[in-house]
């Protein structure tokens, strides 16, 4: 008689109850609810992966002052307005110098481009060539050439326009972008690659990430340097350096400034010009930032033919005169002398001013320092984030080396860069500390990075995203297979149905169990008698 009790309660609860209509209906509804819930959730999450993702491509030529770099980007066609899906698949540096150096021979620009463009053709499937947009953006080198000789600048751009007519891509134009655009696009790139704009929530909808801080961007080119960041509350909104940037329906109040002539190469020319101005001898000078046992001769034209140094020309200027700079590798003197290329006095100790009288709100949040900043830190054997002390001691150590030791310190030795890293490091110190007002406490918030994943941090990605409308101002968010309100409603309805059925079945189970229990108790009493 007792063996019956070894069965599971619901089983025991009976075979009779199972045949009752309400139970069957409840079980069916429960089953259907579970199937529907699982189905719509799976569809909502995985629907986008059902179709084989066709790829789209975009090409940007970053025509910098010292070189042109070609970037190829790709993204899944059906995720056009998603964030974080564009990745860099190829990068090619055009041989020779920047396009601004072709002012006297614009017809030679295309020949320089051809080798990289041939490689690019191999990176993009041929059937997509015609629909692949290609953009050329020229930066500070061409901004300077345009100021110096507008006709020459236009001829260079015309030569490029003409060349791209022969290429099998959808050429969208060659433009000289402003310093402000360069800064904003660099900031967009950094934050896009770091996933700071949007994130996917549980239902695979793109939402603004809660509490995520954007990253400031510090870019160092050959002819200009840019700073861009979302500033705090206290801001002079009347300055042209404050921009309202609307991305995915979220408005960012961005401070961005481009310092023309403060790119690495032009800043060094300013430095050499300053050394010449302050030297008693005009043809043989010492340079505390060049390594010991290193000397180099330049023509006066090399230093003074730039718009950035034209006002520092000596009275008896002859572009063909030769000047020799002898390196003394003196870290403290180098640091002291480099400060003089900045006009810090113009700020009159104002907190909201960087240098040369330029307005800047108080720096805020983390920063990514890329391009020339990264390469200089890398030469000092530094990357990522580190303390100001570490940066200073590495700079001191590097600047103390003599010329013959540098090839041992630098994995990629190139004379032009190697001789100037000491200058660059001291330049970065003054720019960041005395200019942008980074302190010992805030310096570790600067991350010196070259790329995120396999994508270079450069203004070019932000430029392409903007020009191909991949970052809409409004919040398009992704089109889901089931619209969010319908999805949530369906989810709520079937969850409620499932819970009700479970409650009903549980009630039936317990009721039947109670009934069986009383019957067993009665049987037991009879047996014992």
């Amino acid at each position: 008689m007792f063996t019956v009790l070894t069965r599971q309660p619901c089983e025991q609860a009976g075979l009779k109850a199972l045949y009752r209509t309400p139970t069957i209906i409840a079980l069916v509804v429960l089953l259907v609810s579970i199937v529907v819930l699982v189905s719509i959730t799976v569809i909502q999450i995985h629907k986008q992966e059902v179709l084989p993702p066709g790829l789209k491509y975009g090409i940007v030529l970053d025509a910098g002052s010292s070189r042109t770099t070609v970037y190829v980007y790709q993204w899944p066609a059906e995720k056009e307005n998603n964030t974080g899906v564009v990745s860099q698949t190829f990068k090619c540096s055009v041989k020779g110098s920047g396009i601004s150096s072709y002012g006297n021979n614009p017809q030679d620009v295309p020949r320089a481009f051809e080798e990289c463009m041939q490689k690019v053709k191999g990176q993009v499937p041929s059937h997509l060539h015609g629909s692949t947009p290609i953009h050329l953006g020229a930066t500070a080198g061409m901004r300077l050439l345009r100021l110096q000789n507008e006709t020459a600048a236009n001829e260079v751009l015309e030569s490029i326009q003409s060349y791209f007519k022969s290429q099998p891509f959808d050429f969208r134009g060659a433009q000289i972008i402003s310093g402000q655009e360069e800064g904003v696009y660099g900031w967009i790139t950094a934050n896009y690659l770091m996933g700071n704009f949007l994130e996917k929530n549980l239902w695979h909808m793109w939402v603004h990430p809660h509490g995520v801080e954007t990253t400031g961007a510090l870019d160092l080119g050959g002819a200009s340097t840019q700073i861009s960041f979302v500033a705090g509350e206290k801001m002079d909104l009347n300055t042209s350096d404050i921009m309202q940037v609307s991305l995915y329906g979220y408005v960012y109040t961005l401070y961005t400034h481009s310092f023309q002539c403060y790119g690495r190469n032009e800043a060094e020319k300013k430095f050499l010009a300053m050394l010449l101005q302050n030297s008693p001898t005009k043809n043989h000078l010492t340079n505390p930032c060049y390594p010991r046992d290193y000397s180099i001769s330049f023509t006066m034209g090399h230093v003074f033919d730039s718009l950035c140094t034209v006002d520092q020309r000596p009275e008896s200027y002859n572009p063909n005169d030769v000047i020799t700079f002898e390196g003394t590798g003196d870290p403290s003197l180098c640091k002291e002398k480099v400060a003089s290329i900045f006009d810090f006095k113009a700020c009159h100790d104002q907190e909201t001013c960087s240098f040369d009288g330029v307005y800047q709100p108080k720096i805020k949040g983390p920063f990514v320092a890329f391009a020339g900043f990264y390469y200089t830190a890398s030469a000092l054997n530094l990357s990522g984030s580190f303390s100001l002390d570490t940066f200073n001691s590495s700079t001191w150590n590097f600047c103390s080396q003599n010329w013959s030791q540098l090839p041992l310190l630098l994995p990629k030795f190139d004379e032009v860069y190697a001789r100037s890293y000491c200058f660059s490091a001291n330049y970065i110190y003054h720019l960041f500390v005395n200019g942008y007002k980074f302190t010992e406490e805030t310096w570790p918030q600067i991350h010196f990075e070259k790329e995120v994943g396999n994508s270079s941090i450069a203004w070019s990605l932000g430029y392409m995203l903007s020009l191909t409308n991949q970052i809409p101002a409004e919040s398009p968010l992704i089109r889901l297979p089931i619209e969010p309100p319908v999805f949530v409603g369906t989810l709520a309805f079937f969850t409620a149905a499932a819970l009700l059925c479970l409650a009903f079945l549980a009630y039936l189970c317990s009721a039947t169990r109670r009934k069986r229990h009383s019957e067993h108790a009665f049987d037991h009493a009879v047996d014992s008698d």
Partner: antibody, heavy 120, light 112 residues
Framework: EVQLVQSGAEVKKPGSSVKVSCKAS????????ISWVRQAPGQGLEWMGG????????NYAQKFQGRVTITADESTSTAYMELSSLRSEDTAVYYC?????????????WGQGTLVTVSS | KIVMTQSPLSLPVTLGQPASISCRSS???????????LNWFQQRPGQSPRRLIY???NRHSGVPDRFSGSGSGTDFTLKISRVEAEDVGVYFC?????????FGPGTKVEIK
């Protein structure tokens, strides 16, 4: 005056290849784009591809990609178009044409045309 | 790729009378440099094509002034002010603004 002189008519078997030449005279050869255009009997014009001799690399229309090879010999100012895996529908007059301004496919000057007949 | 369409495909004309051929592109032909690379070619019977008009309205050297081109964006027209016997042939429009260059199907001009 720019002149483009093409090689003579060809009769080819299906599956074989044909190579047509185009010799330029008058003006600079290297810097101007040379295009190849074909015209099937009683049909319209179809751009096949082109080359800028100074670069030495050709660009092809998608339809002909992988089957056509365009080359240029700067020393003889001659451009060549080779079409492989011939089929009967490749029977056409093949023209070379040259632009007058730099790098575009403007087709200012035309050769006399080369009739290629594909027949078994 | 850009599709070029022409109308009419056949145009019977009377000597001395004007003639007009229309050409339409599936996309705007304004190139990034601001120019519109739309050309017109004439192909007389048994001859190679020759360029009549470039960049919409510019006559190629040696082309009689009775030929004129006009239009913008996606709609273009070739006009012959007074048709002469030597104008018989097929007229093609061709775009060079977008890759790859493409031709219209041609308009056959014949004397009535």
């Amino acid at each position: 005056e720019v002149q483009l002189v093409q090689s003579g008519a060809e009769v080819k078997k299906p599956g074989s290849s044909v190579k047509v030449s185009c010799k330029a005279s008058g003006g600079t050869f290297s810097s101007y784009a040379i295009s190849w255009v074909r015209q099937a009997p009683g049909q319209g014009l179809e751009w096949m591809g082109g080359i800028i001799p100074i670069f030495g690399t050709a660009n092809y229309a998608q339809k002909f990609q992988g089957r056509v090879t365009i080359t240029a010999d700067e020393s003889t100012s001659t451009a060549y178009m080779e079409l492989s895996s011939l089929r009967s529908e490749d029977t056409a007059v093949y023209y070379c044409a040259r632009g007058a301004s730099g790098y575009d496919w403007s087709l200012d000057y035309w050769g006399q045309g080369t009739l290629v007949t594909v027949s078994s | 790729k850009i599709v070029m369409t022409q109308s009419p495909l056949s145009l019977p004309v009377t000597l001395g009378q004007p003639a007009s051929i229309s050409c339409r592109s599936s996309q705007s032909l304004v190139y990034s440099d601001g120019n519109t690379y739309l050309n017109w070619f004439q192909q007389r019977p048994g001859q190679s094509p020759r360029r009549l008009i470039y960049k919409v309205s510019n006559r190629h050297s040696g082309v009689p002034d009775r030929f004129s081109g006009s239009g913008s964006g996606t709609d273009f027209t070739l006009k012959i002010s007074r048709v002469e016997a030597e104008d018989v042939g097929v007229y093609f429009c061709m775009q060079g603004s977008r890759w790859p260059p493409t031709f219209g199907p041609g308009t056959k001009v014949e004397i009535k």
